[in-house]
């Protein structure tokens, strides 16, 4: 088997064996090494010398195998836009941002640029759980049977109705999607408006 060519090597068809880690240099018609993540090209390749790479300075990065002559500057997460940092910038990765709690991403341009407050879900509903927090605005869904939610809130969850018998009480009024069951002491008389039900 033929030995693997090591950059720089000639390329007649303008393609390189390892597209991720090599690139075609048209002036000399050769394949040269790209620089690994966290580095940049400090000296370009020639026919007799491969690319020379240097580490990105502090507060700058390159995320991919590259033949860039500069590193990208780190940009902080902008709290005015509702963003917060989840991981700092490193030489190999830009600052990782997410929407602050209670917010969702309202504008994307390769990454989230602008977060907005999550909409309230009205009583009787709750926000549908999402795979990823902060990805979209609340979609409110009705509380399932036997549950209630009695506030306007972006994050309140539907709770199960109280079971009066578990507390040694009896039901005075059934729960709804917006209110809990009302319980009373079994010895207490029913309020006047419910006395008819008692006779039934």
């Amino acid at each position: 088997s033929q030995p693997q060519a090591v950059p720089p090597y000639a390329s007649e068809n303008q393609t390189c064996r390892d597209q991720e880690k090599e690139y075609y240099e048209p002036q000399h018609r050769i394949c040269c090494s790209r620089c690994p993540p966290g580095t940049y090209v400090s000296a370009k390749c020639s026919r007799i010398r491969d690319t020379v790479c240097a580490t990105c300075a502090e507060n700058s990065y390159n995320e991919h195998w590259n033949y860039l002559t500069i590193c990208q500057l780190c940009r902080p997460c902008d709290p005015v836009m509702g963003l917060e940092e989840i991981a700092p910038c490193t030489s190999k990765r830009k600052t990782q941002c997410r929407c602050q709690p209670g917010m969702f991403c309202a504008a994307w341009a390769l990454e989230c640029t602008h977060c907005e407050l999550l909409s309230d879900c009205p009583p009787g509903t709750e926000a549908e759980l999402k795979d990823e927090v902060g990805k979209g605005n609340n979609h409110c869904v009705p509380c399932k049977a036997g549950h209630f939610q009695n506030t306007s809130s972006p994050s309140a969850r539907c709770q199960p109705h109280t079971r009066c018998e578990n507390q040694g009480l009896v039901e005075a009024a059934p729960g709804t999607a917006q209110s809990d069951t009302t319980c009373k002491n079994p010895l207490e008389p029913l309020p006047p408006e419910m006395s008819g039900t008692m006779l039934m």
Partner: antibody, heavy 118, light 107 residues
Framework: EVQLLESGGGLVQPGGSLRLSCAAS????????MSWVRQAPGKGLEWVSA????????YYADSVKGRFTISRDNSKNTLYLQMNSLRAEDTAVYYC???????????WGQGTLVTVSS | DIQMTQSPSSLSASVGDRVTITCRAS??????LNWYQQKPGKAPKLLIY???SLQSGVPSRFSGSGSGTDFTLTISSLQPEDFATYYC?????????FGQGTKLEIK
């Protein structure tokens, strides 16, 4: 239609105070960051301050830091700029602007003139 | 702070001309560059955001290009209503800064 209407400008003596207001309509005010930008007579634009949609985060230009305070009342759809210890160099037309994406100002008010002079 | 330098400071041109205004940042700002038009006594108006994106409602004769430190605003065929002052603005980080402006006048 998005509308921003500034008010509160006027003549004030050096060292005095003034509060500018910007009434917003035509969009969900609390969802957007807002900013103040000023322009001295015959000069270019100078950014003054920015505030998040919730009002929890703010930034200021060095030239006004410690003297100006940006705030907002989302229940009234109104942005404010409290200006204290005013100087002659603060004389300018003050514009409020909707600050979008953390990049640019997509809507501007018509401006209000602040004159600081004795 | 990031300094924004526009050139030229003023420019005379005729209706129908192709005009280019340049803006240079003192450090790399990626594509966080916007262009505004301002007419006397009026508020600025957004033309281009993110270096090359045309704001809704802005005529297609306006275009922007560039990345890093060097940017250009081009008006492909000047119309009478285009005579105004143009500003670039960086949105990379605070304090947000504007160029000093380019006044476009009728020749």
């Amino acid at each position: 239609e998005v509308q921003l209407l500034e008010s509160g400008g006027g003549l004030v003596q050096p060292g005095g105070s003034l509060r500018l207001s910007c009434a917003a309509s035509g969009f969900t005010f609390s969802s957007y960051a807002m900013s103040w930008v000023r322009q001295a007579p015959g000069k270019g634009l100078e950014w003054v301050s920015a505030i998040s949609g919730s009002g929890g985060s703010t930034y200021y230009a060095d030239s006004v830091k410690g003297r100006f305070t940006i705030s907002r009342d989302n229940s009234k759809n109104t942005l404010y700029l409290q200006m204290n210890s005013l100087r002659a160099e603060d004389t300018a037309v003050y514009y409020c602007a909707r600050y979008y994406w953390g990049w640019y100002f997509d809507y501007w008010g018509q401006g209000t003139l602040v004159t600081v002079s004795s | 702070d990031i300094q924004m330098t526009q050139s030229p400071s003023s420019l005379s041109a005729s209706v129908g001309d192709r005009v280019t205004i340049t803006c240079r940042a003192s450090q790399s700002i990626s594509s966080y560059l916007n262009w505004y038009q301002q007419k006397p006594g009026k508020a600025p108006k957004l033309l281009i955001y993110a270096a090359s994106s045309l704001q809704s409602g802005v005529p297609s004769r306006f275009s922007g290009s560039g990345s890093g430190t060097d940017f250009t605003l081009t008006i492909s065929s000047l119309q009478p209503e285009d005579f105004a002052t143009y500003y670039c603005q960086q949105g990379w980080w605070y304090p947000l800064t504007f160029g000093q402006g380019t006044k476009l006048e009728i020749k």
